[in-house]
């Protein structure tokens, strides 16, 4: 198209010059470049009411270059495309459009979401989490001893963070109450404050015990809640202390 226009212009204008500027092989005062030096691309630039031929080493933004036997021509990309390989494959869309499969869309198809950074339609990515870790040891204030109700925790990792429209991530840690393993705390695990608290609590429980003589030896459920387990432990402790008291008839002041 441009080459044939160039040929027509040459017939119309006898003042076709061979001493042209900026990569032109032939040119005219009125139309600028009519043909280009080897490997340069011909493009028509609109200046006011007229079109001027220009020869460039590469095509401007919004155009792509095609090499024909008679002309290397810059062709316009599609109207919504800023950079393209050819008419079928846009590589960068104009502002407000999203790139998808080489085409520019004003909104992304279902199942895809707009990435406003790359201006592309991308697959929706849902959160992916790993399996839960095993439950941690049952602990109370960082200790794994002392017949107390504690907590145990398990965690999981986020393997894939979600994209904007993806499903949110689930919690990454879970805590539940448990009974601390029944064992005495070694000296290193007991602090002064801890001993005083235990002494006060023990005296309180002994006072309670004198007014209550319940002996729970009935059938118990095979599955117990942490509360039930703790109550059972406390009752057993109270019975043991009552027997010891009767034997020694001395007030117990320390926990062994």
């Amino acid at each position: 198209q441009n080459a044939s226009r160039g040929r027509r212009q040459r017939r119309m204008h006898p003042n076709v010059s061979q001493g042209c500027q900026g990569g032109c092989a032939t040119c005219s005062d009125y139309n600028g470049c009519l043909s280009c030096k080897p490997r340069l691309f011909f493009v028509l630039e609109r200046i006011g009411m007229k079109q001027i031929g220009v020869c460039l080493s590469s095509c401007p933004s919004g155009y792509y270059g095609t090499r024909y036997p008679d002309i290397n021509k810059c062709t316009k990309c599609k109207v919504d495309c800023d950079t393209c390989f050819n008419k079928n494959f846009c590589t960068k869309c104009k502002s407000g459009f999203y790139l998808h499969l080489g085409k520019c869309l004003d909104s992304c198809p279902e199942g895809l979401e707009a990435n406003n950074h790359t201006m592309e339609c991308v697959s929706i990515v849902h959160c992916e989490a790993s399996e839960w870790s095993p439950w941690s040891p049952c602990m109370k204030k960082g200790k794994t001893c002392g017949f107390k109700r504690g907590t145990e925790t398990r965690v999981r990792d986020i393997l894939q963070h979600p994209s904007a429209k993806g499903n949110l991530c689930p919690p990454t840690s879970e805590t539940r109450t448990c009974i601390v393993q029944r064992k005495k705390c070694s000296k290193g695990e007991r602090g002064k404050k801890g001993r005083e608290r235990k002494r006060k609590k023990l005296n309180k429980e002994e006072r309670k015990e004198t007014s209550s003589s319940s002996d729970s030896k009935g059938l118990e459920s095979s599955i117990e809640t942490p509360d039930q387990q703790e109550n059972k432990e406390r009752q057993q402790q109270q019975k043991r202390r009552a027997r010891d008291k009767q034997q020694k008839s001395v007030s117990v002041s320390t926990v062994h």
Epitope: T66, R67, F85, K87, N88
Partner: antibody, heavy 116, light 107 residues
Framework: EVQLVESGGGLVQPGRSLKLSCAAS????????MAWVRQAPKKGLEWVAT????????YYRDSVKGRFTISRANAKSTLYLQMDSLRSEDTATYYC?????????WGQGVMVTVSS | DIQMTQSPASLSASLGETVTIECRAS??????LAWYQQKPGNSPQLLIY???SLIHGVPSRFSGSGSGTQFSLKINNLQSEDVASYFC?????????FGAGTKLELK
């Protein structure tokens, strides 16, 4: 969806003529340069001819110049290849394709056999 | 005309292997090179343009490289669906020319 459907192939004697057609749909036919590419049995691909989007310029490989004519009817979204003075070496599957530097979309092909 | 020399003409590889197909141009074609895949009984399909730009939907195990006159197509982790003939094509100059093709088979 882009579709290119070739027709008009067949068995023909050397020196005779054949006209291939390619019906296009799923894209703006008048925006695209179109080409014919052929493939001889068990051989490679060979570009035959190209016509630019508006039909104003045509290009041919040397071996078919003066014998083959590529044309188009944009109103009908149809591409043609008029093949005259056929030779045995023209035996091939002929594909019509969009030609925009690369051959992006291809038809299913039509077989042309030139034999006496 | 620019001659495109493709090698090997055929090759046999096992699933999971990496294969490389070479294409040499008789003169500098810059980065104006494409690769096509043609599965048995089908039309060719554009895989790669501008040496290394993958067409949308082409698996990332396909990659192209090179410049000037020496180019290659690499297929990592070969799959059964990759059994096909592969052709290079230059579009730097008319007539656009293709390599003779490489037929890829499974061992």
């Amino acid at each position: 969806e882009v579709q290119l459907v070739e027709s008009g192939g067949g068995l023909v004697q050397p020196g005779r003529s054949l006209k291939l057609s390619c019906a296009a749909s799923g894209f703006t036919f008048s925006d695209y340069d179109m080409a014919w590419v052929r493939q001889a049995p068990k051989k490679g691909l060979e570009w035959v001819a190209t016509i630019i989007y508006d039909g104003s310029r045509t290009y041919y490989r040397d071996s078919v110049k003066g014998r083959f004519t590529i044309s188009r009817a944009n109103a009908k979204s149809t591409l043609y290849l008029q093949m005259d003075s056929l030779r045995s070496e023209d035996t091939a599957t002929y594909y019509c394709a969009t030609h925009d530097k690369t051959f992006d979309y291809w038809g299913q092909g039509v077989m042309v056999t030139v034999s006496s | 005309d620019i001659q495109m020399t493709q090698s090997p003409a055929s090759l046999s590889a096992s699933l999971g292997e990496t294969v490389t197909i070479e294409c040499r141009a008789s003169e500098d074609i810059y980065s104006d090179l494409a690769w096509y895949q043609q599965k048995p009984g089908n039309s060719p399909q554009l895989l790669i343009y501008d040496v290394n730009s993958l067409i949308h939907g082409v698996p990332s195990r396909f990659s192209g490289s090179g410049s000037g006159t020496q180019f290659s197509l690499k297929i990592n982790n070969l799959q059964s669906e990759d059994v096909a003939s592969y052709f290079c094509q230059q579009y730097d100059n008319y007539p656009n020319t293709f390599g003779a093709g490489t037929k890829l088979e499974l061992k």
